[in-house]
Interface confidence: medium
């Protein structure tokens, strides 16, 4: 069964800066990745970035840089100040659409006990939805 993992890290140098890394553990070809915060995409969450293998990357503030790390994983750097700034308990979600598996989504947030610059290892997060 395909899985999605999500890792959230707060940068030690900039406390309002977060790095989100997501990956897809499956054999299919990824056709779209959507990163959102505040909940799953389409269920109250706000889209931060969309990554498409052909059409490229779209990102919205406070996303600063979204990129493919491998053909099946992505990273997103967020920076914010004021109302648009993420906070320590913000939930980030990644949805991977792939062929032939369909869509798989998982969410994660900063580990409660983590110090800036530290993070939990990128273990698979619970799968919230598989379309």
């Amino acid at each position: 069964t395909p899985e999605v993992w999500v890792q959230v890290r707060m940068e030690a140098t900039e406390l309002s800066s977060f790095t989100i890394r997501c990956g897809f553990l499956g054999s299919g070809s990824i056709s779209l990745v959507t990163v959102s915060w505040g909940g799953p995409n389409g269920a109250g969450g706000t889209t931060l970035a969309v990554l498409h293998p052909e059409r490229g990357i779209r990102q919205w503030a406070p996303a600063r840089q979204a990129r493919w790390e491998t053909q099946s994983s992505i990273s997103l750097i967020l920076e914010g100040s004021g109302a648009s700034s993420p906070c320590a308990n913000t939930t980030f979600c990644c949805k991977f659409a792939s062929f032939p598996e369909g869509s798989w989504e998982a969410c994660g947030s900063l580990p409660p006990s983590s110090d800036p610059g530290l993070s939990a290892p990128p273990t698979p997060a619970p799968i919230l939805r598989a379309d």
């Epitope: 070809s29 056709s31 498409h52 293998p53 052909e54 059409r55 490229g56 990357i57 779209r58 600063r64 840089q65 979204a66 990129r67 493919w68 062929f99």
Partner: antibody, heavy 122, light 106 residues
């Protein structure tokens, strides 16, 4: 040999329509997105639009200035990409190029046609 | 849309010269930048993709570097066939190009 050949250009009056064709050979047409570009006389390159590969559902996207007037389509059985241009304006005068790609957007457009000239004038 | 600013708009150089062209994006585009060469009356030709990867068949005197917002195309030793116009292009739709740099004979 991998090749793209455009056709269909010519002189057309403002407000009229024209359809350009881009005939592909030497590669598996359905595996690639196809893009259209244009270059006005003495100017730089401008992206016109894009149609995704068969795998990605053939999605289309256009530059703002042609949205609603131009339509890109593809015929996999003939290995042809089309650019249907309606409500043409004098500022659409340019050499139009089709290009293969991107197969993955980071790869760029690696094969281009020779271009076809469209002149919009009364 | 992401704006691409290329400089210089033109330059004069001699055969054997090292030539550097720069391109700046209005926001970070990671390494998703391509470079093209175009000669008068001809279609563009892909030289460099993903900022620094040399397209197959392109001479090794061409190289690209940069990441984020600032990028460079370098021709290590200019050859007679290199006199042309060069364009940078960012890779996410809507695709946008720099204004071009015309490399002329000094």
């Amino acid at each position: 040999e991998v090749q793209l050949v455009e056709s269909g250009g010519g002189l057309v009056q403002p407000g009229r329509s024209l359809r350009l064709s881009c005939t592909a050979s030497g590669f598996t047409f359905g595996d690639y997105a196809m893009s259209w570009f244009r270059q006005a006389p003495g100017k730089g390159l401008e992206w016109v639009g894009f149609i995704g590969s068969k795998f990605y559902g053939g999605e289309t996207e256009y530059t703002a200035s042609v949205k609603g007037r131009f339509t890109i389509s593809r015929d996999g059985s003939k290995s042809i990409a089309y650019l249907q241009m309606n409500s043409l304006k004098t500022e659409d005068t340019a050499v139009y190029y089709c290009a293969r790609g991107p197969r993955r957007y980071t790869y760029g457009m690696d094969v281009w046609g020779q271009g076809t000239t469209v002149t919009v004038s009364s | 849309d992401i704006q691409m600013t290329q400089s210089p708009s033109s330059l004069s150089a001699s055969v054997g010269d090292r030539v550097t062209i720069t391109c700046r994006a209005s926001q970070s585009i990671s390494s998703y930048l391509n470079w093209y060469q175009q000669k008068p009356g001809k279609a563009p030709k892909l030289l460099i993709y993903a900022a620094s990867s040399l397209q197959s068949g392109v001479p090794s005197r061409f190289s690209g570097s940069g990441s984020g917002t600032d990028f460079t195309l370098t021709i290590s030793s200019l050859q007679p066939e290199d006199f042309a116009t060069y364009y940078c292009q960012q890779s996410s739709t809507p695709l946008t190009f720099g204004g071009g740099t015309k490399v002329e004979i000094k």
